[in-house]
Interface confidence: low
Amino acid sequence: IPVIEPSVPELVVKPGATVTLRCVGNGSVEWDGPPSPHWTLYSDGSSSILSTNNATFQNTGTYRCTEPGDPLGGSAAIHLYVKDPARPWNVLAQEVVVFEDQDALLPCLLTDPVLEAGVSLVRVRGRPLMRHTNYSFSPWHGFTIHRAKFIQSQDYQCSALMGGRKVMSISIRLKVQKVIPGPPALTLVPAELVRIRGEAAQIVCSASSVDVNFDVFLQHNNTKLAIPQQSDFHNNRYQKVLTLNLDQVDFQHAGNYSCVASNVQGKHSTSMFFRVVESAYLNLSSEQNLIQEVTVGEGLNLKVMVEAYPGLQGFNWTYLGPFSDHQPEPKLANATTKDTYRHTFTLSLPRLKPSEAGRYSFLARNPGGWRALTFELTLRYPPEVSVIWTFINGSGTLLCAASGYPQPNVTWLQCSGHTDRCDEAQVLQVWDDPYPEVLSQEPFHKVTVQSLLTVETLEHNQTYECRAHNSVGSGSWAFIPISAGAHTHPPDEFLFTP
């Protein structure tokens, strides 16, 4: 534990005096005291000297020396009084904030211990303290108002008798903040309610608080309902419960129900909506387009939202063709309940194969009947291209067939040299075929188109390329004649390279 010199608990000096406080410890030491002017600090290893050669009343206070490295946290203290005949009080703070029932320390420090007998606490402008104000005084620390109340939030002054007259400190504002837990906690069950006319229903509104002084009511639209209140106390909380029992609901029972609870802190409310329907209902919908296009090999999740009352008695996904009689695997279908009356059903279709294109239907059943929602899934394919040489009406013709989905566009290129694919530098001519002939176009299948390029003479050191593209990708086929004058020979005498 550090040691302070002079080794007295209190030191009394006059204004203007020189004061030297020395602290010695095993390791480095630190001083802590009221913020006041004129102090000089010298530190030298395990000792620290706090000194002033012009003490003022503002230096009055307790100075504590601590040894930061000491695991036991030992400290020593000395209280300094600078007894100024004109200044009996040193006020360390002009605003003090506490919560109700805490002790509030008003830090007016007496500058002369001799004056202790004549001290008192008053409100500003000499007004007496409020009734039941319980306080004590310490010359080292000031006045403490015990278990402060909100009403004691006032401006105070410390008073001392000097030569038969009362001398006041500057004022200290005390703010006592109320500790109120807040509005009561509420529950309203259920959060949403649907019933068919004639069925029974129950709505429960409950509120709880640590304080018994609160009100709770259940409101239907703007009408406050008169419901007998059930009260309880458990888990250190008061609970008040209102239970609305409707044996046979009718349309006038529908609407907004608000559970409202209030106390001195304010009000909380929570609401629910009660829907009364004529008969069972079952509505299927999807945020997705019912016509889906996906690239082959990719995945797709089909989602259906179901709104139903009463609850579902059955549901399933079905594949309606046209490619095979396979059915979706149950493990790829899942259901999630959003709330009591709304559910989401998802069918996962990973890595789609050509045979999985077609119609998928979600079917659901409740007492209101069956409902179905059908998705049409078309797969997208990049074009596949082939070219053959043939004669049409006596003219030599290159015939290009392209198959893909969406329908491919066709472009012909003629380029110099023999190549698998024409590049820009080699291109001699380009023909776009804006209207290739559609050979086949069936739902859920690829579209096959055919484009004809009439060529009077096939140039021998050249390549003819048919390119097809769509939104998925592109494909091409290069046709290379291998001898001059080939146009006079039938197609099978020519080499063509895919």
């Epitope: 904030v97 909100f150 009403i151 939030s153 703010k175 903040q177 109320k178 807040g182 509005p183 304010g266 009000k267 909380h268």
Partner: antibody
Framework: QVQLVQSGPEVKKPGASVKVSCKAS????????MHWVRQAPGQGLEWMGW????????NYAQKFQGRVTMTRDTSISTAYMELSRLRSDDTAVYYC???????????WGQGTLVTVSS | DIVMTQTPLSLPVTPGEPASISCRSS????????????LDWFLQKPGQSPQLLIY???YRASGVPDRFSGSGSGTDFTLKISRVEADDVGVYYC?????????FGQGTKLEIK
């Protein structure tokens, strides 16, 4: 120093909604209730409600129940007042006001003029 | 809701003269629990936000000159200005906050003669 800075003027059509913000600085935002008060042109002051910034709890004047929503974002020390289904008689200057721990309104925002006109 | 009624609605005053504004509530603003009377006075100067003058019946807000004072009890309250200055012009409002909704008086416009 304590400051409440409100968002700029708004012009809205009847039936629309408006959301006014009030950014607090210079004090602990969650330590004080924030109230909203409005003043129609040439008229007096009208209390709308309060929000407890620490819990988000609110208390609205009955007149505005169902149309007013008071929210806050403690991360940016900002309170919001949203009024929906606006009518021409909602044309007013809307003020936020801090409630001191002694309950009185010690600081007010500069006001936001909301004009509702077709 | 508690109704607050102010009189007069307009108050022309000569600088240096005293002024008095009355406010009446439809029910008592005295809180029996803590003994406080929850009535406040505000001044709204032209083109400005309201500013607090007096809170909890008689406490002057920070920075308010001691020319302003509040008094009253129960349901009848008075704001007094001992010597009116040119800077005091504006609309004065009383407000109750003993219960929700807080309500204001209709305002008293103080003008300089």
């Amino acid at each position: 120093q304590v400051q409440l800075v409100q968002s700029g003027p708004e012009v809205k059509k009847p039936g629309a909604s408006v959301k006014v913000s009030c950014k607090a600085s210079g004090y602990t935002f969650t330590g004080y209730y924030m109230h909203w008060v409005r003043q129609a042109p040439g008229q007096g002051l009208e209390w709308m409600g309060w929000i407890n910034p620490i819990s988000g709890g609110t208390n609205y004047a009955q007149k505005f129940q169902g149309r007013v929503t008071m929210t806050r974002d403690t991360s940016i020390s900002t309170a919001y007042m949203e009024l929906s289904r606006l009518r021409s008689d909602d044309t007013a200057v809307y003020y936020c006001a801090r409630q001191d721990n002694w309950n009185y309104f010690d600081y007010w925002g500069q006001g936001t003029l909301v004009t509702v006109s077709s | 809701d508690i109704v607050m009624t102010q009189t007069p609605l307009s108050l022309p005053v000569t600088p240096g003269e005293p002024a008095s504004i009355s406010c009446r509530s439809s029910q008592s603003l005295l809180d029996s629990d803590d003994g406080n009377t929850y009535l406040d006075w505000f001044l709204q100067k032209p083109g400005q936000s309201p500013q607090l003058l007096i809170y909890t019946l008689s406490y002057r807000a920070s920075g308010v000159p001691d020319r302003f004072s509040g008094s009253g009890s129960g349901t009848d309250f008075t704001l007094k200005i001992s010597r009116v200055e040119a800077d005091d012009v504006g609309v004065y409002y009383c407000m109750q906050r003993i219960e929700f909704p807080f309500t204001f008086g209709q305002g008293t416009k103080l003008e300089i003669k």
